[in-house]
């Protein structure tokens, strides 16, 4: 069975084709080659001689036991080599020779027992080394690491490392890899020698499910003393063994580290006193809790110095009391419990993401809700009922506002967005909004993107509601049950580039409403019920138009519509996916491509 | 279509078939077997994925005695610092994991429950596997 040609001459997918040898019938120019799940078993020297341009090579699960000297010789452009799941028994010293551009090497689950004997010291361009899920017992980074000056990611997770000694990291003292991210999760650690990490700088250190008791965790974290880390991730996994006990003593050792950003990711334990628990983390710039349960929600009003707080997928008894002077960014998403939003006091806040919490807002939105006048980004999407009772007084700095898939109430009772003259992006898609007031978008003079799909309009008619939106470049009106539109609805939108009118209920097409759209490039009218044109003579769309989508409509392919069908043919160079433009009627022409119709009508009336 | 038996409990019998062309082998054990009246146990899965599990989610299509419930989407792996360790599993890497589960207080009516599980992962998204579970529920006297 031949390989699948994904991109001609470039990308070939040869997965699971029972190949015993490297195929020789693929073009020399191949850049991406997936040979995974083939029983190759043995790679001799110059195995890939036929593919000098290769950039990505996937050899996952190829039953490879032996890799000889120079197996990849000639692959001087290869940037990614994937060897996952091969039971390698013999790896020649020159196995990886010739890989002068290699940036990513994945040797996950390859029976690797030690980094010392892994022949990669010459791979100077290497940025990412993934040796997770192996049999490595020693964390000693061999001397050759001093050659790997570009290394940014080292994944040693799911190995057998139990202890870390001062000598293990000597090479990092000699040539500090300032940008190195190190993942040691799922190693059964019980000892980190104090001083092992002294004066070491890491970009990121991840330690999840490393400790089988609170005491071990405590002493190991104390062993990290002197480490300077940009981002520290601690925690567990839901499907691995979890700590039976967790208290404030666990993290006391963090006081001896310099940490910029901290994240606790999954803990099968109720956190009650977070002030004591995170006492050593009051001055990190970014603090993040993922998938934890928090009992006392008042603690977030303590004088933490965080600039970014992230609470994701957590459980709360009620919406937390948030009073944090220095906080600039708050991400509070996908949490459970506390369904009603309560006011927060965050005077420096500029970015607020409250999406996907099922929250309801009794009154939205003004400065008093968030305790700030600096807000630029507000995401309230995928929540419950949000009642609009104020038009963003004190929130005039907003540039990005997202309500999608929440249930907005009182949207047509006053000009909700009147204060938002700096707003650039607005998404009110699928918010149960029924537009019954022409002033709904008054005030939005800077708006560039408006998404309002999945709403409805009085009498299914689009009125002149966009008159002030002179900077609009993107407008989505799909799934709005629209049937008619004002001929002047779009007259002020001279900057509009993309207009999505798909999935509405138009029976006919009219070019007249678009005559002022001098910048329009994309017009999508797919999934309507267009049968013909509104007027006999259709004018041209704006000359800027590059893509016109009329697919999945109800074209009536009869002589009476000859001029419309001919007009469609004349637009051929604009039309996308023409094969999905089919006749719906009459029954003998149903399913025929509109563009293949021979429209020569004998008018036998 | 070959049917794979999972287990029997006092009130349920569970089996599955593949609903995709690939039919890549997957081993599923439940211990103890699920009782629909209330249950607590361990689900053990052994599987070698044909693509990375990053951003794994399930589409669930549940049928209760021929009545279709709305499609449910269950996100398992968000893409960074995920709850489950297998979320970091790569294409071709052995996934050998045990997941605890528990539920209680749901009353199910007697009959045939079908659940099509479409596993989608990766970027771009593609189907990882598709399994159709059949649960025959025979509530006992209490």
């Amino acid at each position: 069975e031949p390989c699948v040609e994904v991109v001609p001459n470039i990308t070939y997918q040869c997965m699971e084709l029972n190949f015993y040898k490297i195929p020789d019938n693929l073009p020399f120019s191949t850049k991406n080659l997936d040979l995974s799940f083939n029983p190759l078993r043995h790679l001799g020297s110059y195995s890939f001689f036929s593919f000098p341009e290769l950039q990505v090579l996937d050899l996952s699960r190829c039953e490879i036991q032996t890799i000889e000297d120079g197996a990849y010789q000639s692959l001087s452009h290869l940037s990614t080599l994937i060897l996952t799941g091969n039971p390698i028994q013999s790896l020649a010293l020159g196995a990886f020779s010739g890989l002068s551009s290699l940036q990513k090497l994945v040797a996950v689950e390859t029976n690797l027992a030690s980094l010392e004997n892994f022949p990669i010291g010459h791979l100077k361009t290497l940025k990412e080394l993934n040796v997770a899920h192996n049999l490595i017992q020693s964390f000693k980074l061999p001397e050759y690491f001093s050659n790997l000056t570009n290394l940014e990611h080292l994944d040693l997770s799911s190995n057998k490392i139990q202890s870390i000694y001062c000598t293990d990291l000597r090479v990092l003292h000699q040539m500090p890899l300032l940008n190195l991210s190190l993942d040691l999760s799922l190693n059964p650690m019980n000892f980190i020698q104090p001083g092992a990490f002294k004066e070491i700088r890491l970009h990121k250190l991840t330690l999840r499910n490393n400790f089988d008791s609170l005491n071990v965790m405590k002493t190991c974290i104390q062993g990290l003393a002197g480490l300077e880390v940009h981002r520290l991730v601690l925690g567990e996994f839901r499907n691995e063994g979890n700590l039976e006990k967790f208290d404030k003593s666990a993290l006391e050792g963090l006081c001896n580290l310099t940490i910029e950003e901290f994240r606790l990711a999954y803990l099968d334990y109720y956190l009650d006193d977070i002030i004591d628990l995170f006492n050593c983390l009051t001055n990190v710039s970014s603090f993040s809790l993922v998938s934890v349960t928090i009992e006392r929600v008042k603690d977030f009003s303590y004088n933490f110095g965080w600039q970014h707080l992230e609470l994701v997928n957590c459980k709360f008894g009620q919406f937390p009391t948030l009073k944090l002077k220095s906080l600039k960014r708050l991400t509070f998403t996908s949490n459970k419990g506390g369904n009603a939003f309560s006011e927060v006091d965050l005077p420096s806040l500029e970015f607020l993401d409250l999406s996907r919490n099922g929250l309801s807002f009794k009154g939205c939105c003004s400065q008093s809700d968030f305790g700030t006048t600096s807000l630029k980004y507000l995401d309230l999407s995928f929540n419950g009922v949000i009642t609009m009772s104020s038009n963003f007084l004190g929130l005039e700095q907003l540039e990005h506002l997202d309500f999608q898939h929440s249930n907005l109430k009182q949207m047509s009772e006053f000009s909700v967005f009147l204060s938002l003259r700096n707003l650039i992006y607005l998404d009110i898609s699928h918010t149960h909004t029924r537009v019954a007031f022409n002033g709904i978008f008054n005030g939005l003079s800077s708006l560039e993107v408006l998404k309002m799909a999945g709403n409805s309009f009085q009498e299914n008619f689009l009125p002149d509601i966009f008159t002030e939106l002179r900077n609009l470049t993107f407008l989505d009106l799909s799934q709005c049950q629209l049937e008619q539109l004002s001929p002047t609805a779009f007259n002020s939108l001279s900057s509009l580039q993309v207009l999505n009118m798909s999935h509405n209920n138009f029976f006919s097409l009219d070019t007249f409403p678009y005559k002022c759209l001098n910048s329009l490039q994309v017009l999508d009218y797919s999934l309507n019920h267009i049968m013909t044109s509104k007027k006999q003579e259709l004018q041209h769309f704006p000359s800027s138009l590059a893509f016109l989508n009329l697919t999945q409509n109800d074209f009536a392919c009869t002589c009476e519509h000859q001029s419309f069908l001919q007009w469609i043919k004349d637009q051929r160079q604009l039309l996308v996916e023409v094969e999905r433009m089919e006749c719906a009627t009459p029954s003998d022409k149903q399913g025929m491509p509109v563009l293949s119709l021979n429209i020569t009508c004998q008018m036998n009336k | 279509q070959k049917q794979y038996w999972v287990c029997n409990s006092s009130d349920a019998s569970i089996s599955y078939t593949y609903c995709d062309k690939m039919q890549y082998p997957i081993s599923i054990n439940v211990n103890p077997c699920i009782e629909l009246k209330r249950s607590k146990g361990l689900l053990h899965i052994f599987y070698i994925p044909r693509r990375d599990l990053k951003q794994l989610y399930f589409n669930l299509y549940i049928t209760v005695n021929t009545m279709n419930l709305p499609k449910r989407k269950e996100v398992i792996c968000r893409g960074s610092d995920d709850d489950y360790s297998f979320c970091r599993a790569l294409k071709g890497e052995t996934v050998n994991t045990t997941i605890s589960f528990s539920f209680k207080g749901i009353k199910f009516s007697k009959g045939k429950y079908k659940c099509v599980v479409e596993a989608i992962s990766g970027s771009p998204e593609e189907m990882l596997f598709c399994l159709e579970f059949v649960i025959l529920h025979q509530p006992n006297s209490n």
């Epitope: 008619q484 209920n505 029976f507 999934l527 019920h529 109800d554 009627t585 | -």
Partner: nanobody, 119 residues
Framework: EVQLVESGGGLVQAGGSLRLSCVAS????????MGWFRQAPGKERDIVAR????????YYAESVRGRFTISRDNAKNTVYLQMNSLRPEDTGVYYC????????????WGQGTQVTVSS
Amino acid sequence: EVQLVESGGGLVQAGGSLRLSCVASGRTLSTVNMGWFRQAPGKERDIVARISGSSVSTYYAESVRGRFTISRDNAKNTVYLQMNSLRPEDTGVYYCVADSPGGRSYEYWGQGTQVTVSS
């Protein structure tokens, strides 16, 4: 399952009038487009008129424009076709059609009702 049942067909003289009715049962179709197709003897089935769920939009084939009127009563789940100034070429079987609530066009069909216009 949705069922469409037409009535009102029959024999009429040229210049006369008929009113066709179509009742939908099985589920409410108040939001979907409905319409009438005609199959004249020896010809293909083709659309005559169509109306949106809100009655805001209508479409008529050129041959019936000004003579036929499509309307609907959503409370009764019924769509009508008022046919005036009938001509012999209007003879045929008239079918009621409805889109699916998901938006698929011409998803449900009635069995048809015969209209014969004699000269």
